[in-house]
Amino acid sequence: SQPQAVPPYASENQTCRDQEKEYYEPQHRICCSRCPPGTYVSAKCSRIRDTVCATCAENSYNEHWNYLTICQLCRPCDPVMGLEEIAPCTSKRKTQCRCQPGMFCAAWALECTHCELLSDCPPGTEAELKDEVGKGNNHCVPCKAGHFQNTSSPSARCQPHTRCENQGLVEAAPGTAQSDTTCKNPLEPLPPEMSGTMLM
């Protein structure tokens, strides 16, 4: 036979040496070059010529080494679905979208297709931090010891309790998961009706 180093070359077992950059063309029983990202097949290969590639037109792309005869149409991020653009479409990459702030991905099909509002975390809790923002709905976890969070919010974080002594004050009432420590001037007694506030 006639061993060849570059496509097109004969393939007896229907596999090609470089699976990423070559493909098996069954009519001619050969391995041919794929087109690089940002291009498409303008003329198919044969035993006598390799694949001919052309650049994707404006507003279209192909992300991978391919043997597609067309480029994919760029699509905008749909704000109605709660998406926003983080990077524009190029010939080599589709528009990069993410969920708008305060939203999470509720429908996933290779990429996020629909975002919904994050659930509120009640007082005394905060949203567990995730590796990737917008990937899932909030999972509320209790504030750890010495911290509080006093609102219903999808994004508020638990804050450390105020340390009265750092301000030259004394503790009038201890902090809870839902409220801060109450401090008072060490010289003044705390009136009974003024709990939960800091007196100067």
Epitope: S1, Q2, A10, Q27, H28, S46, R47, I48
Partner: antibody, heavy 120, light 107 residues
Framework: EVQLVESGGGLVKPGGSLRLSCAAS????????MYWFRQAPGKGLEWVAT????????YYPDSVKGRFTISRDNAKNSLYLQMSSLRAEDTAVYYC?????????????WGQGTTVTVSS | DIQMTQSPSSLSASVGDRVTITCKAG??????LSWYQQKPWKAPKILIY???RLADGVPSRFSGSGSGTDYTLTISSLQPEDFATYYC?????????FGGGTKLEIK
Amino acid sequence: EVQLVESGGGLVKPGGSLRLSCAASGFTFSDYYMYWFRQAPGKGLEWVATISDGGSYTYYPDSVKGRFTISRDNAKNSLYLQMSSLRAEDTAVYYCVREENGNFYYFDYWGQGTTVTVSS
Amino acid sequence: DIQMTQSPSSLSASVGDRVTITCKAGQDIKSYLSWYQQKPWKAPKILIYYATRLADGVPSRFSGSGSGTDYTLTISSLQPEDFATYYCLQHGESPWTFGGGTKLEIK
């Protein structure tokens, strides 16, 4: 000994249909791409259809695309050509042909042919 | 489609003669050319493949040469059984196309 024996030819009216068969023997049929070629009376040879070894891929020239269908049954060592919407210009001897399965892609065995006549 | 131009279309020769038939492709077919012999009422038979290689069982008086677009079939010393029609076929690019044939007749 490799043998390819065609059958199913005959006289058919324009617009009619016919199914050709080819019985293969003497080799592992499922290892080979198979073809149909034809030869009109007093004319040269013409490629008609191709089918891959497993039958997944089929190919046709524009002259028969949409009218002819090649198929195979590897369990029965048989090749078929279903012809429909036949025209006078489809009148020819039809040959069942094996393509060698190495790297040179030539046609090493041909059947004796079956005659198809399209006439009113 | 790749056009295959075969010449001559017919040829008269005598037993013992050296005969040459040529095929010209419309573009470089990278030696993906084979030659077939056909006798009346018979199927074609392979003679030469990949432009120059002799098929199994074919007498050595048959030979093929050429590359690119120009190819030749030579019969070095004609025998009585060689009087037939000869076809070239390109199978480098689909659709596969044949030359028009050369009818070799006894002079």
